[in-house]
Amino acid sequence: IIDGAPCARGSHPWQVALLSGNQLHCGGVLVNERWVLTAAHCKMNEYTVHLGSDTLGDRRAQRIKASKSFRHPGYSTQTHVNDLMLVKLNSQARLSSMVKKVRLPSRCEPPGTTCTVSGWGTTTSPDVTFPSDLMCVDVKLISPQDCTKVYKDLLENSMLCAGIPDSKKNACNGDAGGPLVCRGTLQGLVSWGTFPCGQPNDPGVYTQVCKFTKWINDTMKKHR
């Protein structure tokens, strides 16, 4: 997270980290006791999922292995459209004050809405500095028309843009798959942006979760 600050302790109990061994790979969100939602481009053969602590490496955190993941069937490695994936935990997460399910959206929030993006990704770019504590930054949703002015034909209709004009506030490497939460509901998953991260007036691009709630619920039901 660029130009952010440590999240208020316990304010993101649905935030998870997907680890490859002990190394941060991506962010994600807990949908229920068995399922994590992340970005499709974060796919690996096996995952270790960190839950229940804002601090990576915290011994009190839950660490659960996951070996099954289901990319959206429409995901494209070329355009990165439909960049979302469900990861099935090998054992159930124990819900607590620090481990909660995220609220999936019942509607798409409009441009101008203030949202929070969070993650353990690098806080500097192109030189990397990985924090141990979960970082947060507030950004505003940007209309597709305004975002298309920046990204032109790279933008697809299930992508959502967010940022602050003339500001560095943005996500970065390691934050991918993590949550963009607006008015208490999950509206986006970190998908992509420009490099180096935090270039003013280059918005972050997110998978627009409100367009995929049916696929999320159907996929969890199908692979119960």
């Epitope: 481009h41 770019s125 991918a176 998908s191 992509w192 420009t194």
Partner: antibody
Framework: QLQLQESGPGLVKPSETLSLTCTVS??????????WGWIRQPPGKGLEWIGS???????YYNPSLKSRVTISVDTSKNQFSLKLSSVTAADTAVYYC???????????????????WGQGTTVTVSS | DIQMTQSPSSLSASVGDRVTITCRAS??????LNWYQQKPGKAPKLLIY???SLQSGVPSRFSGSGSGTDFTLTISSLQPEDFATYYC??????????FGGGTKVEIK
């Protein structure tokens, strides 16, 4: 300003292993969000990508060379290296090391252009 | 593997001419295409990344366009220092990263 410098023997015998090192100055391999790669150019021919290594240690190789190639990083010396085994005359080329600049973060991070190059070193395979 | 085909393989032009080089991918590569310039005995130099973004320090007479399978590098007004060989390169998330065969721009 970042600079890359290739070094290694200019002559290698057939069936032996070609070993080259790229020394990076003006920046750190271990804490920079870039790829570090090797490209070669046979005399009078075009460019061929050999492989790349990410600062975290992940490697990516050209499938046509994969069985013979190893790329590694020595962060303490700020160097990355190429080893190409069982060489033949067809491996005679100018070998370049280069930095791969990602086109974006997240899903666009795996795509990159080589924005800083070494000046190249000529390697001849001959007995 | 994705094949990159450049055309023409060589061309003769005069200072001040508008020069266009094309690159065709054997399958769609979205906008993941870079252009390089190489002078004899020198390392290649990145000119254009992501099909149309100008690398810093590169003169604005160079421009790139295209998406999918067909891409173009244009030099709006050829200068003496532009006589060189130009390569396109596609950068997929999975190897191999491949270069076109090159286009040599010579003095007419």
């Amino acid at each position: 300003q970042l600079q890359l410098q290739e070094s290694g023997p200019g002559l290698v015998k057939p069936s032996e292993t070609l070993s080259l090192t790229c020394t990076v100055s003006g920046g750190s391999i271990s804490s920079s969000d870039y790829y570090w790669g090797w490209i070669r150019q046979p005399p009078g021919k075009g460019l061929e990508w050999i492989g790349s290594i990410y600062y975290s240690g992940s490697t990516y190789y050209n499938p046509s060379l994969k069985s013979r190639v190893t790329i590694s990083v020595d962060t303490s010396k700020n160097q990355f290296s190429l080893k190409l085994s069982s060489v033949t005359a067809a491996d005679t080329a100018v070998y370049y090391c280069a930095r791969g600049r990602p086109l974006g973060y997240g899903a666009r991070h795996y795509y990159y252009g080589m924005d800083v190059w070494g000046q190249g070193t000529t390697v001849t395979v001959s007995s | 593997d994705i094949q990159m085909t450049q055309s023409p393989s060589s061309l003769s032009a005069s200072v001040g001419d508008r020069v266009t080089i094309t690159c065709r991918a054997s399958q769609s590569i979205s906008s993941y295409l870079n252009w390089y310039q190489q002078k004899p005995g020198k390392a290649p130099k990145l000119l254009i990344y992501s099909a149309s973004s100008l690398q810093s320090g590169v003169p604005s007479r160079f421009s790139g366009s295209g998406s999918g399978t067909d891409f173009t590098l244009t030099i709006s007004s050829l200068q003496p220092e532009d006589f060189a060989t130009y390569y396109c390169q596609q950068s997929p998330p999975f190897p191999p990263l491949t270069f076109g065969g090159g286009t040599k721009v010579e003095i007419k």
